[in-house]
């Protein structure tokens, strides 16, 4: 399992370490989640051939996974700090239902799946403190999320495996784009 933020495995323990700044905490938190996703992807890819499948489009039709686009202001061209931060927080809030779906989808990495979910909640809190315009952030409707979760859990085994793979891949892409954008803020 990844080392919790603040004891990041990518840091050599330094004596008298300075307390982490807000930016550093966010960066570490995202790296921590990405490490967790890598571990979950390993189990998914080992368990099925989803990672090599060319039938992703079939399953993608059932999903509305958040994606970064140029209009979101997170790319270097047309970068807009406020618009981008709203997109990142909104996207993470939208991913929460999919992270809930991932719970119980893993055998040997059950704790890892929980860690990714909980760490994402903490990341959202960090980012909300950073955001000036919280009114612009739309929170997903709980009823809609509940019915989406029911629908995803009712899929056949193949679609459930494919959905798991797509969620992990999309979440990884979203976090990587977020990481780069946040480094410009």
């Amino acid at each position: 399992a990844p080392v919790p933020p603040g004891e990041d495995s990518k840091d050599v323990a330094a004596p008298h370490r300075q307390p982490l700044t807000s930016s550093e905490r966010i960066d570490k938190q995202i790296r921590y989640i990405l490490d967790g996703i890598s571990a979950l992807r390993k189990e998914t890819c080992n368990k099925s051939n989803m990672c090599e499948s060319s039938k992703e489009a079939l399953a993608e039709n059932n999903l509305n996974l958040p994606k970064m686009a140029e209009k979101d202001g997170c790319f270097q061209s047309g970068f807009n700090e406020e618009t981008c931060l709203v997109k990142i927080i909104t996207g993470l809030l939208e991913f929460e239902v999919y992270l809930e779906y991932l719970q119980n989808r893993f055998e040997s990495s059950e704790e890892q799946a929980r860690a990714v979910q909980m760490s994402t909640k903490v990341l959202i809190q960090f980012l909300q403190k950073k955001a000036k315009n919280l009114d612009a952030i739309t929170t997903p409707d709980p009823t809609t999320n509940a019915s989406l979760l029911t629908k995803l859990q009712a899929q056949n085994q193949w679609l459930q495996d494919m959905t798991t793979h797509l969620i992990l891949r999309s979440f990884k892409e979203f976090l990587q784009s977020s990481l780069r954008a946040l480094r410009q803020m």
Partner: antibody, heavy 120, light 106 residues
Framework: QVTLRESGPALVRPTQTLTLTCTFS??????????VGWIRQPPGEALEWLAH???????YYNPALKGRLAVSKDTSKNQVVLSMNTVGPGDTATYYC????????????WGQGILVTVSS | DIQMTQSPSSLSASVGDRVTITCRAS??????LAWYQQKPGKAPKLLIY???YLADGVPSRFSGSGSGTDYTFTISSLQPEDIATYYC????????FGQGTKVEIK
């Protein structure tokens, strides 16, 4: 096995546009987190980062050269193209392409480089 | 934009010596730093990424440390094949290289 190879003209006239192609194998620019960057090194001088392009078409440029550079990708051909307009003698250098993977963002594989001379 | 100041620009040491190179960023780069080795006429080679991680196949005599703005690259016991120029590079935003450190044998 990952390989990258730079190709383009060895000699360019001042004021012209330099176009370099990086052809790679062993990885795909469709893979999330993957990026290809361009770096140059004038003779006897230090490395200078120019630009890089990510799998999702996000592009980053050296601010000092931003107006003169354009980077694009053709994932079907496994190629990344760098264009630099209005070149001058100061652009004489060995140009390298390199790949970065994932959020550790270090250039783990490099091409062998191509020496480009700008002269009339 | 973040500037990288690498020192010294050159150094001369004996085989077996401990060699240290430093890189200072103009602001916090949160351990997003790589170190490269470049031999004459060759492309650079990645040695260290994320400030402390050894790249695949790199001998353990090379190491990296640091956090915040200050980073150090160390060769614990200099070997003849380590004669090269070493560069740091950060990855916080747009990534410049340090000016390089040329390592020679006394």
């Amino acid at each position: 096995q990952v390989t990258l190879r730079e190709s383009g003209p060895a000699l360019v006239r001042p004021t012209q546009t330099l176009t370099l192609t990086c052809t790679f194998s062993g990885f795909s620019l469709n893979t999330s987190g993957m990026t290809v960057g361009w770096i140059r090194q004038p003779p006897g001088e230090a490395l200078e980062w120019l630009a890089h392009i990510w799998w999702n078409d996000d592009k980053y440029y050296n601010p000092a050269l931003k107006g003169r550079l354009a980077v694009s990708k053709d994932t079907s051909k496994n190629q990344v193209v760098l264009s630099m307009n209005t070149v001058g003698p100061g652009d004489t250098a060995t140009y390298y392409c390199a790949r970065m993977e994932d959020y550790d963002e270090a250039m783990d594989y490099w091409g062998q480089g191509i020496l480009v001379t700008v002269s009339s | 934009d973040i500037q990288m100041t690498q020192s010294p620009s050159s150094l001369s040491a004996s085989v077996g010596d401990r060699v240290t190179i430093t890189c200072r960023a103009s602001e916090n780069i949160y351990s997003n730093l790589a170190w490269y080795q470049q031999k004459p006429g060759k492309a650079p080679k990645l040695l260290i990424y994320a400030a402390t991680y050894l790249a695949d196949g790199v001998p353990s005599r090379f190491s990296g440390s640091g956090s915040g703005t200050d980073y150090t690259f160390t060769i614990s016991s200099l070997q003849p094949e380590d004669i090269a120029t070493y560069y740091c590079q950060h990855f916080w935003g747009t990534p410049p290289f340090g000016q390089g450190t040329k390592v020679e044998i006394k």
